[in-house]
């Protein structure tokens, strides 16, 4: 059910493209294609190419993205396009000028002097933005989200975007300055991963990050399963970067026991993050037989 045909506006197309990209990434990383048939991988890549081509129709002259061409471009959506295209670049041919043009726009047009990224064109399909939907601590969570996207595009775009390292550092400094006052576990998790990517998740931030976990296995807000899966996935990625392998198993088990395999309304971020995190776990941690993800993928019929 994760391999779907992308369609619709600039937001809906990304909603449709997300699960296919992350499914292929997950199955590549965990070497599980033989379960589904290697020919299915090629079919999935065709769907990713289709999604990529369709998304280009929503690229504005500035290289930013919006749901429709007559709407103001969205910081969040553009960062998300950067994130998905960066991952897809390992799977299909992605024009680096397209990807790095979006990166440049984020830095030059949307980053304030204090490092914060601002949103002037909010996403219409609010269900796709995950835990960021809760307006509390939005400056930090958006800045962390963009910073993570920039880090993921760094290998491809560093040569084309001179201001990329400086932009990342500025955003990181803002997150550092705000981190100890954060209250939402979601923000603590996403911002923690952003800091970990910069090798800055150390004391006192590390203590705050770890102590925010409930029962040392999840970053949780009441009655928000999708946000909690997303937040805990960010936290798992941070723990893996920290090589804190002692803390990882209960987090992985919690994610696994949510029996959350993606798909469904409002699932875009949770789907992307849980499979990115579990793929990273299976790459970083040898002998990971304790993870028994019963994943099923269905290709759309033609």
């Amino acid at each position: 059910h994760l391999i779907v045909t992308p369609a619709g506006c600039g937001e809906q197309n990304m909603i449709g493209m997300t699960p296919t990209v992350i499914a292929v990434h997950y199955l590549d990383q965990t070497e599980q294609w033989e379960k589904f048939g290697i020919e299915k991988r090629q079919e999935a890549l065709e769907l990713i190419k289709k999604g990529y081509t369709q998304q280009l129709a929503f690229k504005q002259p500035s290289s930013a993205y919006a749901a429709f061409n007559n709407r103001p471009p969205s910081t969040w959506l553009t960062a998300y396009v950067v994130k998905v295209f960066s991952l897809a670049a390992n799977l299909i041919a992605i024009d680096s000028h397209v990807l790095c043009g979006a990166v440049k726009w984020l830095i030059l047009e949307k980053q304030k002097p204090d490092g914060v990224f601002q949103e002037d064109g909010p996403v219409i399909h609010q269900e796709m933005i995950g835990g960021f939907r809760n307006a509390k601590e939005a400056d930090v969570s958006l800045t962390a989200f963009v910073l993570i996207a920039l880090q993921e595009a760094r290998d491809i775009c560093e040569g084309q975007v001179n201001s990329l390292p400086g932009s990342i550092n500025k955003a990181g400094e803002y997150i550092e300055a705000s981190y100890m006052n954060l209250q939402r576990p979601y923000t603590v998790a996403i911002a923690g991963y952003a800091l970990a990517l910069m090798n800055k998740l150390e004391e006192p931030y590390l203590g705050k990050f770890l102590n925010t976990a409930k029962d040392r296995n999840r970053w949780e807000e009441p009655d928000q399963q999708l946000y909690n899966v997303e937040a805990t996935s960010y936290a798992l990625l941070a723990l893996l970067l920290l090589k804190d392998f002692d803390s990882v198993p209960p987090v992985v088990r919690w994610l696994n026991e949510q029996r959350y395999y993606g798909g469904g309304y409002g699932s875009t971020q949770a789907t992307f993050m849980v499979f990115q995190a579990l793929a990273q776990y299976q790459t970083d941690v040898p002998d990971h037989k304790d993870l028994n993800m019963d994943v099923s993928f269905h290709l759309p019929s033609r």
């Epitope: 029962d215 040392r216 026991e257």
Partner: antibody, heavy 120, light 108 residues
């Protein structure tokens, strides 16, 4: 930190019974709690645990007949139905070590246990 | 249940000697293993968690180790107060978790 089980008594087969674990010195809003039993002269048997948010996890054999629930910030109940003589045991509650998953971080401390006898 | 096979069922050692208890997991459980000590009429006491980490207040003569799916509790320089029954607890998943059958340790 201390724990104490209560509610153990002699019951007839088929009777439901609820045991209570009362904690002092800490709040269950931040701690996990597990239940374990021990038949007379036998080994320990894991039943299940409850996390600080109230989500429950059971051993496969205990699913359906045993229910763990948090009744306040200091009490956790173990509800047992369709009791048989095989359920005769001392029932222990134990907190997750350091407030974590008790199956990973271990169970510490433990209560002294309460004896349940099922007999006709 | 078959998750954990604990050996031996009983053993004895002289004061100052060494006791070794093993638990074999039916499949990989990584570090999901803890060790407990129980004396007659008392609740169990946590000794080791995460396969090899010493619980707070536990003497350093207790040592947990892992090799693949085999887990070992070693007590070196055994003391009289170490006479007890020892149990491992292994977890494949939350619903597939069990204690070993126990090892009775007698001090001569």
């Amino acid at each position: 930190q201390s724990l104490e089980e209560s509610g153990g008594r002699l019951v007839t087969p088929g009777t439901p019974l609820t045991l209570t674990c009362t904690v002092s010195g800490f709040s269950l809003s931040r701690y996990t709690m597990a239940w374990v039993r021990q038949a007379p002269g036998k080994g320990l048997e894991y039943i299940g645990w409850i996390d600080s948010s109230g989500s429950t996890y059971y051993a496969s054999w205990a699913k359906g007949r045993f229910t763990i629930s948090k009744t306040s910030s200091t009490t956790v109940d173990l509800k047992m139905t369709s009791l048989t003589t095989e359920d005769t045991a001392t029932y222990f509650c134990a907190s997750g070590n350091d407030g974590g998953d008790p199956l990973y971080y271990g169970m510490d401390p433990w209560g002294p246990g309460t004896l349940v006898t099922v007999s006709s | 249940d078959g998750v954990m096979t604990q050996t031996p069922s009983s053993t004895s050692a002289a004061v100052g000697g060494t006791v070794t208890i093993k638990c074999q997991a039916s499949q990989s459980i990584r570090s999901w293993l803890s060790w407990y000590q129980q004396k007659p009429g008392q609740p169990p006491k946590l000794l080791i968690y995460e396969a090899s980490k010493l619980a707070s207040g536990v003497p350093s003569r207790f040592k947990g180790s892992r090799s693949g799916t085999e887990y070992t509790l070693a007590i070196s320089g055994v003391q009289r107060e170490d006479a007890a029954t020892y149990y491992c607890l292994g977890s494949i998943a939350s619903d597939d978790t069990a204690f070993g059958a126990g090892t009775n340790v007698e001090i001569k």
